[in-house]
């Protein structure tokens, strides 16, 4: 299963960030977004968004904090390889 492409983190504020990515139409049933403060373990947050979406706003983030985010495409119950990025609020 090919991964989504071109993950961009934009509009970063002290407590939010916009994720956007590309994928062929109807390539995935949904996208799984996982993010966590980079310096912590056991804190990963998992979100699912519809396969028709190509952006998502992360909210409730902590100011001045580095985050690691990964996005996976999901099709027929199978998960693609991830596309990952690191950003700081």
């Amino acid at each position: 299963l090919p991964a989504p492409k071109n993950l961009v983190v934009s509009e970063v504020t002290e407590d939010s960030a916009r994720l956007s990515w590309t994928a062929p139409d109807a390539a995935f049933d949904s996208f799984l977004i996982q993010y966590q403060e980079s310096e912590k373990v056991g804190e990963a947050i998992v979100l699912t968004v519809p396969g028709s979406e190509r952006s998502y706003d992360l909210t409730g983030l902590k100011p001045g904090t580095e985050y690691t985010v990964s996005i996976y495409g999901v099709k027929g119950g199978h998960r693609s390889n991830p596309l990952s990025a690191i950003f700081t609020t």
Epitope: Q34, Q36, K40, V41, G42, E43, A44, P82, S84, I86
Partner: antibody
Framework: QVTLKESGPGILQPSQTLSLTCSFS??????????VGWIRQPSGKGLEWLAH???????GYNPALKSRLTISKNTSSNLVFLKIASVDTADTATYYC?????????WGQGTSVTVSS | NIMMTQSPSSLAVSAGEKVTMNCKSS????????????LAWYQQKPGQSPKLLIY???TRESGVPDRFTGSGSGTDFILTISNVQAEDLAVYYC????????FGSGTKLEIK
């Protein structure tokens, strides 16, 4: 040299609040990326994570026990505390505190707690 | 919650043999730009507290003999002990530390 040592009441009665203390040395909870957690193990059984606290005072709790747990710290004294409210016999276990830094890398020797009427 | 399933629950081998034990997570514990598996293995000898052997699924903790090897990725992991010694008598737990913290129920290693 990193060390952690747990202390507790030993024995307490059902419905009481269990208060545990973790005293540690060899690291600081002022250091970014560092946390301390609590794990318990009933005799002859497996390991169960209870709670953890980070250098920045973020806390995490086992969802099944969250309503009964309170974790806190005294950074300057190198102490972490865990309170478990309304204990019953199912809370009888050995309680361990652990350092978390990228992984749970150092464990205390454990303190045995018995809940009995 | 991510559930961790270990197998077998116990096994017995003779000293000098090689042993493998399995751990399966209910969802992938692979995460991040560096593609790390948030999976550790612990050894708990009778009457002692657990000791970290392996983290990031395959990185040996300092001081751990190289006969302990961790492998696997995603949801399926293996701990291999080559040339088993009498002092390896213990229960071995796998543990995920990606989303909260959960442990497997353990594999008890006995020496024949």
């Amino acid at each position: 040299q990193v060390t952690l040592k747990e202390s507790g009441p030993g024995i307490l009665q059902p419905s009481q609040t269990l208060s545990l203390t973790c005293s540690f040395s060899g690291f600081s909870l002022n250091t970014s990326g560092t946390g301390v957690g609590w794990i318990r193990q009933p005799s002859g059984k497996g390991l169960e994570w209870l709670a953890h606290i980070w250098w920045d005072d973020d806390k995490g709790y086992n969802p099944a026990l969250k309503s009964r747990l309170t974790i806190s710290k005294n950074t300057s004294s190198n102490l972490v505390f865990l309170k478990i409210a309304s204990v019953d016999t199912a809370d009888t276990a050995t309680y361990y505190c652990v350092r978390i830094k990228g992984r749970m890398d150092y464990w205390g020797q454990g303190t045995s707690v018995t809940v009995s009427s | 919650n991510i559930m961790m399933t270990q197998s077998p629950s116990s096994l017995a081998v003779s000293a000098g043999e090689k042993v493998t034990m399995n751990c399966k997570s209910s969802q992938s514990v692979l995460f991040g730009s560096k593609q790390k598996n948030y999976l550790a293995w612990y050894q708990q000898k009778p009457g002692q507290s657990p000791k970290l052997l392996i983290y990031w699924a395959s990185t040996r903790e300092s001081g751990v003999p190289d006969r302990f090897t961790g492998s696997g990725s995603g949801t399926d992991f293996i701990l291999t002990i080559s040339n088993v010694q009498a002092e390896d008598l213990a229960v071995y737990y796998c543990h995920q530390y990606l989303s909260l913290f959960t442990f497997g129920s353990g594999t008890k290693l006995e020496i024949k």
